[in-house]
């Protein structure tokens, strides 16, 4: 709100732009016939300092010279970098009610001389692009600083462009707007950047380059791939490039990969054959270009081409297992299960599985296709049966995998020994065993199979299994292992035509059960009491139950109860006890024990035996 210096003037010595650390003298002078009316001697000139439009100091005490009622000079020091505003005001001391009147003002800029620009770098994007250079300006000057970019070259070629930096914009890049053509490929060019402000000037060192040094080809475009005879592993990658390109770099990877396959192609002319692709795999392809074999820069990578390679017929063999159960006097139900092929083996979308069950001697064959990973059939119990399964996609089928249907636990001599199951952590169990002691035929492989000890559908909840080579005696099972669930684990030893198995229960984590078994009945037979119970519901077991405990004590007794501990067997739901006195009323209850501890007690039942004491 300065009224354009109607009352007087303000001047700065040595200049309104000063180097950091310098002092300045500011003089404020009233024009003739201006000032406080009637009493010129009462004219008082004051100087106010503003930073970012905020009053920060009254410089009354910094006067170094004073012509009373006419002019005053103030010395200012320790000015910070950037711009500071000083306003001179007139204070008529005889009139306390009137505020000081602005006289004039001045801006002082504090800065530094520019440093020589460094790290000049020039590029021309594409054969038809223009030369643009960038540089590092060095320290901020806090002053308006002009930069001039000059280029000189053969045939008296000269060119220059300018820009400036101030507190609102930065100048560290200029486009000269000229195009260097390939016919100047061997020529040398020199660029220099000069910086000038009110406190000084500086120049960069000259930067020399050739056409090849600075021209960056445009990235290739219009990328496409053609698969030879719909092959899933071979394809021709094609693209468009600038005319002078002599070298390309190709990179490609499956979409879920973290490392690229890299290929260099010389004089590819926009075409390259790839031979090592994985069928039915989403790939990403990118290409970069260079104008010279040894010198020059690579272009940026092209935009990605994303595409899926075609299918090829499945390879690899299916992992088959089965379950066998007699379902009447001369028939058995065979349930075949198999694991899906992994993507590198499936090499396409598996449309169906071809399943064959064959009776070897009578040459009876049952065939079917299914989209599921299991298949169940009822067949005679007689005869030697073999099963095979193959997987089919749109291009063909895998080689069938064969398995002989044997009685998996039929040969005691083939049963593995010393089977143990240890919880390793929350979601796996380590199973170990020793080989069969007196196997009359060689073990071809072990199968470790596990199922949750929970009611389940035979076909909806297939078994989980691992195939183990015959020289291994351990398996870490983790597929579908959940904490606080008990699993029945079988280790099968298979020979060519026989099988033996051993079972164990195991869990990956356990807690004490939520409740004890529920006593349903107490009956007396031949001087023995039979306690009957219902098992703890599966969700409340919280691991493998090791044993049940039956407790009893005389009613109203404060003595410790007696107890009987019985090994847990799912098939057992009653147990005799025989140490109770006749005609004494007892209270009985049960608990269950896992490796983590004992459950709370189940329901209490009272009973008074009638028979004579044992």
């Amino acid at each position: 709100n300065i009224d354009v210096c109607k009352l007087g003037t303000v001047t700065v010595q040595p200049a309104p732009v000063i180097p950091l650390g310098s002092a300045a003298n500011i003089s404020c002078s009233l024009n003739p016939k201006q000032g406080c009316s009637h009493y010129p001697s009462s004219n008082e000139l004051i100087l106010l300092k503003f930073v970012n439009d905020v009053l920060v100091e009254n410089l009354h005490g910094k006067k170094v010279h004073d012509h009373t009622g006419h002019s005053s000079t103030f010395q200012v020091t320790n000015l910070s970098l950037g711009m500071t505003l000083f306003v001179c005001k007139l204070n008529c001391s005889n009139s306390q009610k009137k505020p000081p009147v602005p006289v004039c003002g001045v801006e002082i800029s504090v800065g530094v001389a520019p440093e020589p620009p460094q790290n000049i770098s020039c590029v021309q994007e594409g054969e038809n692009g223009t030369v643009a250079c960038s540089w590092n300006s060095g320290k901020v000057t806090y002053l308006k600083t002009n930069y001039t970019l000059q280029l000189s070259g053969p045939n008296n070629l000269t060119c220059q462009k300018q820009c400036f930096s101030d507190n609102r914009q930065n100048c560290n890049r200029l486009d000269l707007g000229i195009n260097l053509s390939p016919d100047l490929a061997e020529s040398r060019f020199i660029v220099r950047v000069t910086a000038i402000n009110d406190l000084g000037n500086s120049s960069s060192l000259p930067h020399t380059f050739t056409f090849l040094d600075i021209v960056i080809p445009l990235p290739p475009w219009d990328i496409r791939i053609n698969f030879l005879n719909a092959s899933g592993s071979r394809g021709t990658l094609q693209w468009e490039d600038e005319g002078q390109v002599v070298l390309n770099q190709l990179r490609y990877q499956p979409l879920n990969s973290t490392s690229w396959n890299m290929v260099n192609a010389t004089n590819a002319k926009g075409k390259y054959d790839l031979r090592d692709l994985r069928p039915f795999t989403e790939y990403e392809f990118q290409i970069s270009s260079k104008l010279h074999l040894s010198g020059g820069s690579w272009s940026n990578w092209s935009e990605s081409l994303r595409t899926r390679t075609p299918e090829e017929e499945p390879v690899g063999i299916l992992d088959i297992w089965y379950m066998k159960q007699d379902i009447d006097y001369d028939r058995q139900q065979i349930s075949l299960f198999w694991k899906s092929l992994n993507p590198s083996e499936a090499r396409g979308k598996i449309l169906h599985y071809q399943v064959t069950l064959q009776e070897v001697t009578k040459k009876t064959t049952l065939q079917n296709t299914t989209r599921h990973t299991s298949w169940t059939r009822v067949i005679p119990r007689t005869g030697a049966w073999t099963a095979s399964v193959s997987a089919a996609n749109s291009k063909g089928a895998s080689a069938p995998t064969h398995i002989n249907i044997v009685d998996l636990c039929g040969t005691g001599l083939l049963a593995p020994h010393q089977v143990s199951a240890k919880s390793e952590n929350m979601d796996n169990i380590l199973v170990t065993w020793q080989p069969p002691k007196k196997a009359d035929s060689a073990v071809r492989e072990y199968i470790v199979e596990w199922r949750a000890l929970q009611p389940g559908s035979i076909t909806k909840f297939p078994p989980h299994w691992l195939r183990i080579p015959p020289d291994n005696m351990s398996a870490l099972i983790s597929e579908n292992i959940k904490p606080y669930i008990c699993y029945e684990i079988r280790v099968h030893a298979l020979s060519e035509s026989q099988g033996g198995c051993s079972s164990i229960r195991g869990d990956s984590k356990h807690k004490a059960p939520v409740s004890g078994p529920h006593i349903t009945a107490i009956t007396e037979k031949k001087e023995r009491l039979f306690i009957s119970w219902t098992h703890i519901p599966f969700p409340e077991q919280r691991g493998c139950i090791l044993h049940y405990r039956i407790y009893w004590k005389e009613r109203d007794s404060t003595a410790q109860p007696e107890l009987c501990e019985i090994q847990y067997r799912r098939s057992q739901n009653s147990h005799p006890i025989s140490s109770l006195q006749p005609r004494v009323t007892y209270v009985l209850w049960m608990t269950a024990v896992t490796a983590a501890g004992e459950s709370p007690q189940g329901n209490e039942r009272e009973f008074c035996p009638q028979g004579k004491a044992n």
């Epitope: 599921h372 949750a452 035979i458 029945e488 079988r490 079972s503």
Partner: nanobody, 119 residues
Framework: QVQLQESGGGLVQAGGSLRLSCTAS????????MYWYRQAPGKQREFVAY???????NYLDPVNGRFTISRDNAKNSVYLQMNSLKPEDTAVYYC?????????????WGQGTQVTVSS
């Protein structure tokens, strides 16, 4: 526990049809594999047909093409449609459900329904 109740049996002329029904109740959350068996006088009980959780079915050879097993999960029911009945199909027909706990198979049986085919 699981309870199974059959119905739909009766006396029918050779060449006729009957539809047997079996309804499951109780702890049926894991009962997906349902079977029909039959036992003729003086003979052992034999498998007739089954249907799996994935609606895959399988039949005893002599009834294949004449009998059809189906299910209605909403009603917890399984059915046996018997067409072109023959005198040798005369038997008590039983509904059966199997479930697996670990490697042990638990079986549940209905009371049976009499089918008599007269010539």
């Amino acid at each position: 526990q699981v309870q199974l109740q059959e119905s739909g049996g009766g006396l029918v002329q050779a060449g006729g049809s009957l539809r047997l029904s079996c309804t499951a109740s109780g702890s049926i959350f894991a009962i997906d594999d349902m079977y029909w068996y039959r036992q003729a006088p003086g003979k052992q009980r034999e498998f007739v047909a089954y249907i799996t959780a994935t609606n895959s079915a399988n039949y005893l050879d002599p009834v294949n093409g004449r009998f059809t097993i189906s299910r209605d999960n909403a009603k917890n029911s399984v059915y046996l449609q018997m067409n072109s009945l023959k005198p040798e199909d005369t038997a008590v027909y039983y509904c059966n459900a199997k479930q697996i706990v670990g490697f042990q198979i638990d079986e549940y049986w209905g009371q049976g329904t009499q089918v008599t085919v007269s010539s």
